[in-house]
């Protein structure tokens, strides 16, 4: 029987700016029952403060809602582990909120082949931002990402969308059923996970661009 | 603890490049950016740029088009190429990792240095 | 580039002095996130540098309460309240808000 090992906040994870969650590996638990806290302070700050929520983010995780959120302040935060047999404490981790927002996937994409009389077909592509996410507020830039491919291809096209929700190709294989995907990232942050699949028939007579 | 140990040639022809390693323990490079740094001798510090926890990199504009920076995550060793090197390249050369989690400037770990001299 | 220039470029002082820094940037190095990225650091003869101060005026784990940070803008003062032996070396201020980063040229505090 031992005190117990070590633990490491591995990650931390916000939606908006707005909450995040934080979670970390156990370190060997000694043989003996173990628990776990998190504490933290805020820049400029002596103060320790327990995690406000050990729910929301599954095991081993410390949740902090919109009241313990603050985008402009950097948190200093420490997971303790203790047994029978004494303690071990984490590194400390500085999170900075700005720096660790990977939002949900894009909403609604819709995908139609347009076949204007006068000019070249296309394929529009069209998305909405996540609803987590106010753009409004003029605090969050949001870059996307398209990928497709014929559905028996094993390569990617990407395109980079910059801020729009809406996109045209041009370059189109006739006849071929293709896979489409958006993902979006914050101008600091992570990109999303891709949006679910949507499928789109090219029609035989699409032509293809130059 | 967090440590960063730096490896690389310490004398440079003129017209050559420069490779230096620097090796980290105590964290990942999945979770924090590490950046080039170097010093003249006797002269002040030059930030050359980073290579970010998801492998996006940042560079100084003066020095861009010779500089490059990689990392193997699965190593934990992040790597400095410099090419076409002239005598007032000669620094000490360090690598110092990011002090927030997933972030970028702020360099809370340095390694120790490794001194290029560039003569032929 | 933002040009981070540091006065004074030598400063001599004696031991209990308090000391006082200048760091000004070319333009105002606010981040896009409203965050301000400008550091402290004292590099030691023959050391590493080593992190004093993050954004602004937040002590790094382990420094001292005699060092502390202010200012907003392009206008940063680092301020030593009680200098001891071991805070002699040059300091250099830092910006990482804008790419790409700068330094500042450096001040020495050194005995009088």
């Known amino acids: 029987q031992l005190p117990p090992g070590k633990p490491e906040i591995f990650k931390c994870r916000s939606p908006n700016k707005e909450t995040f969650t934080c979670w970390w590996r156990p370190g060997t638990d000694g043989g003996l029952p173990t628990n776990y806290s998190l504490t933290y302070h805020r820049e400029g700050e002596t103060l320790m403060h327990e995690c406000p929520d050990y729910i929301t983010g599954g095991p081993n995780s410390c949740h902090f809602g919109k009241q313990y959120t603050s985008m402009w302040r950097t948190y200093i935060m420490m997971v303790n582990a203790t047994n029978q047999m004494g303690s071990s404490f984490s590194d400390e981790l500085y999170v900075d909120v700005t720096y660790i927002v990977q939002p949900d996937p894009p909403l609604e994409l819709a995908v139609e082949v347009k076949q204007p009389e006068d000019r070249k077909p296309y394929l529009w592509i069209k998305w909405s931002p996540p609803t987590l996410i106010d753009l409004k507020t003029g605090w969050f830039t949001l870059l996307y990402e398209i990928r497709l491919k014929p559905e028996k291809a094993a390569e990617w096209e990407i395109h980079f969308a910059g801020q729009q929700t809406e996109f045209k190709i041009l370059s189109l294989h006739p006849g071929q059923k293709y896979l489409v995907q958006v993902r979006c990232k914050p101008d600091h942050g992570y990109w999303s996970a891709w949006s679910p699949a949507t499928f789109i028939q090219i029609p035989s007579d699409f032509t293809m661009n130059d | 603890q967090v440590q960063l140990q730096q490896s690389g040639p310490g004398l440079v022809a003129p017209s050559q490049s420069l490779s230096i390693t620097c090796t980290v323990s105590g964290f990942s490079l999945t979770s924090y950016g590490v950046n080039w740094v170097r010093q003249p001798p006797g002269k002040g510090l030059e930030w050359l740029g980073i290579?970010?926890?998801?492998?996006?990199?940042n560079y100084n504009s003066a020095l861009m088009s010779r500089l490059s920076i990689s990392k193997d995550n699965s190593k934990s060793q992040v790597f400095l190429k410099m090419n076409s090197l002239q005598t007032d390249d000669t620094a000490m050369y360090y690598c110092a990792r990011s002090l927030y989690y997933y972030g970028s400037s702020s360099f809370a770990y340095w390694g120790q240095g490794t001194l290029v001299t560039v003569s032929a | 580039d933002i040009v981070m220039t540091q006065t004074p470029l030598s400063l001599p002082v004696s031991l209990g002095d308090q000391a006082s820094i200048s760091c000004r940037s070319s333009q105002s190095i606010v981040h896009s996130n409203g965050n301000t990225y400008l550091e402290w650091y004292l590099q030691k003869p023959g050391q590493s540098p080593k992190l004093l101060i993050y954004?602004?005026?937040n002590r790094f784990s382990g420094v001292p309460d005699r060092f502390s940070g202010s200012g907003s803008g392009t206008d940063f003062t680092l301020k030593i309240s009680r200098v001891e032996a071991e805070d002699l070396g040059v300091y250099y201020c830092?910006?990482?808000?804008?790419?790409?980063?700068?330094f500042g040229g450096g001040t020495k505090l050194e005995l009088k």
């Open positions: 290579i970010g926890a998801g492998g996006s990199t």
């Open positions: 954004k602004v005026s």
């Open positions: 830092f910006q990482g808000s804008h790419v790409p980063w700068t």
